[in-house]
């Protein structure tokens, strides 16, 4: 459309704006009980862990962001049984970690979840 | 807990995953006519915003991250009427932009919300 | 480094269109804003409009609704049409970028006269 | 508009001299985000624009440092500490802050 009235510099910061909000991996704090499906007496600490999601805006409203790469990461976290019949242990957990990510249209699409040890 | 069979360097990384995850402004991207409540004959270029929102998490499924103060940023935005009547109108949207959250219980409360102009 | 080239005709006549194209080496549009600027005789320099990457244009209102820039992404140019010319639009015809900092690469210019 | 007016026309120098032109804008072009957006651009014959110096005071790439410029507001000065032969040419202003945007009238810097 025609700019009748706005100069580079302005257009600019909207620019850099526009790019920051794109789909893209974000840093993303992810519940891990809730994640994994574990019954309710089983509690992880820390209760969340950090991962880079898809997160961002499409500029279709028939699109959303979705991952198109995915890499797994370790994270070791205390598993905790309730009542507290033995020590906490150090369990490995790996945690879903976007990579890639890409305006898609909303068709059905199972999302990617954690993989537990 | 007891730790008995964890070594210190082993903690720590937990422990600074941990900090990561806790409640606290995170810089999140924002549909801005959704959040303004727009008629669907209006668009904004760019759609989306960034700001910062309280998120991560509470170590009590009682408590949610909530934010405690709240500033108001101005974003500089096209504004669309469709059909394209008039050039794109550039329009301050002025966006909540939260700058302390907290752990609070999970009583009702009327979320912040973006004040227009 | 960024390269720019005008192409086009060196002869047009008076109320006919004037059409330009810039190609744009060692650049992709998916950044930065793409200007036209003209050097009348008598060293006298004009900012003419420019079009975004996004296709948002501006046109210097002296010129109200005779000129039109457009662009072809998957080419890496971008037009200017200048139209219902006159002997006042015999000029020196520039294409530039303006990236981080304003009017930083310029193409090389073509001379364009209006006469009959 | 913003008229942008430069000081002198024409200028003549020796090699070696000092070379001083001054651009003055009609009202202030310090742009609404606190930069002021005022480039100077030196045309060689039968060359393109070249920039020199962008947002008053900035060398842009390439650009021998005896080259300089300084201002605020209204009034801007491009220096040339000494001048050289490959300097000679045409020395234009621009401001990049108000469309639309607008150059200054050109200095013609010359041998004596």
């Known amino acids: 459309f025609a700019a009748t009235f706005y100069d580079i510099e302005t257009l600019k910061v909207i620019d850099e704006e526009w790019q920051r909000t794109q789909c893209s991996p974000r840093e993303t704090c992810v519940e891990v009980a809730s994640e994994l499906g574990k019954s309710t007496n089983t509690f992880f600490k820390p209760p969340c862990v950090n991962v880079f999601r898809c997160g961002g805006c499409c500029n279709e409203e028939s699109l959303i962001c979705m991952n198109t790469s995915t890499s797994y990461i370790s994270k070791q976290l205390f598993e905790i049984s309730v009542p507290l019949t033995s020590v906490p242990e150090l369990v490995p957990v790996k945690v879903a970690n976007h990579t890639g990510c890409k305006c898609l249209p909303t068709a059905p699409r199972h999302p990617y979840s954690i993989i537990r040890r | 807990f007891a730790a008995t069979f964890y070594d210190i360097e082993t903690l720590k990384v937990i422990d600074e995953e941990w900090q990561r995850t806790q409640c606290s402004p995170r810089e999140t991207c924002v549909e801005v006519a959704s959040e303004l409540g727009k008629s669907t004959n209006t668009f904004f270029k760019p759609p989306c915003v960034n700001v910062f929102r309280c998120g991560g998490c509470c170590n009590e499924e009682s408590l949610i991250c909530m934010n405690t103060s709240t500033s108001y940023i101005s974003k500089q935005l096209f504004e669309i009427s469709v059909p394209l009547t008039s050039v794109p109108e550039l329009v301050p949207v002025k966006v909540a932009n939260h700058t302390g959250c907290k752990c609070l219980p999970t009583a009702p409360r009327h979320p912040y919300s973006i004040i227009r102009r | 480094e960024v390269q720019l080239q005008e192409s086009g005709p060196s002869l047009v006549k008076p109320s006919q269109t004037l059409s330009l194209t810039c190609s744009v080496t060692?650049?992709?549009?998916?950044?930065?804003?793409w200007n036209w600027i003209r050097k009348f005789p008598g060293n006298r320099l004009e900012y003419m409009g420019y079009?975004?990457?996004?296709?948002?244009?501006y046109y210097n209102p002296s010129l109200k609704s005779r000129i039109s820039i457009t662009r072809d992404t998957s080419k890496n140019q971008y037009y200017l049409q200048l139209n219902s010319v006159t002997t006042e639009d015999t000029a020196t015809y520039y294409c530039a970028r303006w990236g981080t900092v304003p009017l930083d690469y310029w193409g090389q210019g073509t001379s364009v006269t209006v006469s009959s | 508009d913003v008229l942008m007016t430069q000081t002198p026309l024409s200028l003549p120098v020796s090699l070696g001299d000092q070379a001083s032109i001054s651009c003055r804008s009609s009202q202030s072009i310090v742009h609404s985000n606190g930069n002021t957006y005022l480039e100077w651009y030196l045309q060689k014959p039968g060359q393109s624009p070249k920039l020199l110096i962008y947002k008053v005071s900035n060398r842009f790439s390439g650009v021998p440092d005896r080259f300089s410029g300084s201002g605020s507001g209204t009034d801007f000065t491009l220096k040339i500490s000494r001048v050289e032969a490959e300097d000679l040419g045409v020395y234009y202003c621009?401001?990049?802050?108000?469309?639309?945007?607008?150059f200054g009238g050109g200095t013609k810097l010359e041998m004596k």
């Open positions: 079009i975004s990457y996004r296709g948002v244009t």
């Open positions: 621009f401001q990049g802050s108000h469309i639309p945007y607008t």
């Open positions: 060692g650049d992709s549009f998916t950044s930065d804003y």
